[in-house]
Interface confidence: low
């Protein structure tokens, strides 16, 4: 049995930030689970992870440099991504794995969400401005 995942087909990040909600055909209450968000058609980049179990506080982290937060619902995880760059416009896929109680469950691959990053171009400002002309 596979968990089904629903995502919005497209989201626009106007201020370099977006909320992406992953809705599951499974109640996460009282489960040990790992929800993750992946970037690219091949899901090669793991953007953000939300991990929950009984004994510790909800863990939200990114190992790939994304600024992310996560919020848990009965049958959903919402990923809040900030400081996105225009060149991070891509398709993003929700993944869910339930480790406990048995059996291990994961999801059918979803259709994904295209996140179109508009807004400000987050370019690093130069440390020293160029010479001013007289």
């Amino acid at each position: 049995n596979k968990i089904l995942v629903k995502q919005s087909p497209m989201l626009v990040a106007y201020d370099n930030a977006v909320n992406l909600s992953c809705k599951y055909s499974y109640n996460l209450f009282s489960r040990e689970f790992r929800a993750s968000l992946h970037k690219g058609l091949d899901s090669a980049v793991e953007v953000c992870v939300v991990y929950g179990n009984y004994s510790q506080q909800l863990q939200v982290y990114s190992k790939t440099g994304f600024n992310c937060d996560g919020k848990l619902g009965n049958e959903s995880v919402t990923f809040y991504l900030q400081n996105l760059y225009v060149n991070q416009t891509d398709i993003y896929f929700c993944k869910i794995e339930v480790m406990y109680p048995p059996p291990y469950l994961d999801n059918e691959k979803s259709n994904g969400t295209i996140i179109h990053v508009k807004g400000k171009h987050l370019c690093p400002s130069p440390l020293f401005p160029g010479p001013s002309k007289p």
Partner: nanobody, 120 residues
């Protein structure tokens, strides 16, 4: 000293209703996330429901969703569990617990429990 005192349990027929209460003291109730859990005879502890400190967000286990409602009255330092359409499998000792983190996670204090028996 943290104290959680459950009440409202008893014998009820299938299809009936009960309202459990939990009187809390010894901590700042209005800033504490709270849970109800239950333990059926010979079984492990099962999480039933969770409510965040302000009382806006709630979570339910599949087995009770649509039948049970968790609520709280912060002015009275009291947690409630309204149980409708009760079934024989709801028979258990029900515990009120303080849950410092999110809905899926452990508690740091719980009460002594109140017994709910659903039988005809």
């Amino acid at each position: 000293e943290v104290q959680l005192l459950e009440s409202g349990g008893g014998l009820v027929q299938p299809g009936g209703s009960l309202r459990l209460s939990c009187a809390a003291s010894g901590f700042t109730f209005d800033s504490a996330n709270m849970s109800w859990a239950r333990q059926a005879p010979g079984k492990g502890l099962e999480w039933v429901s969770w409510i965040e400190a302000p009382g806006v967000q709630t979570y339910y286990a599949d087995s009770v969703r649509g039948r049970f409602t968790i609520s709280r009255d912060n002015s009275k330092n009291t947690l409630y569990l309204q149980m409708n359409s009760l079934r024989a499998e709801d028979t258990a000792v029900y515990y009120c617990a303080r849950s410092p983190f999110g809905p899926l996670y452990g508690f740091d204090y719980r009460g002594q429990g109140t017994l709910v028996t659903v039988s005809s």
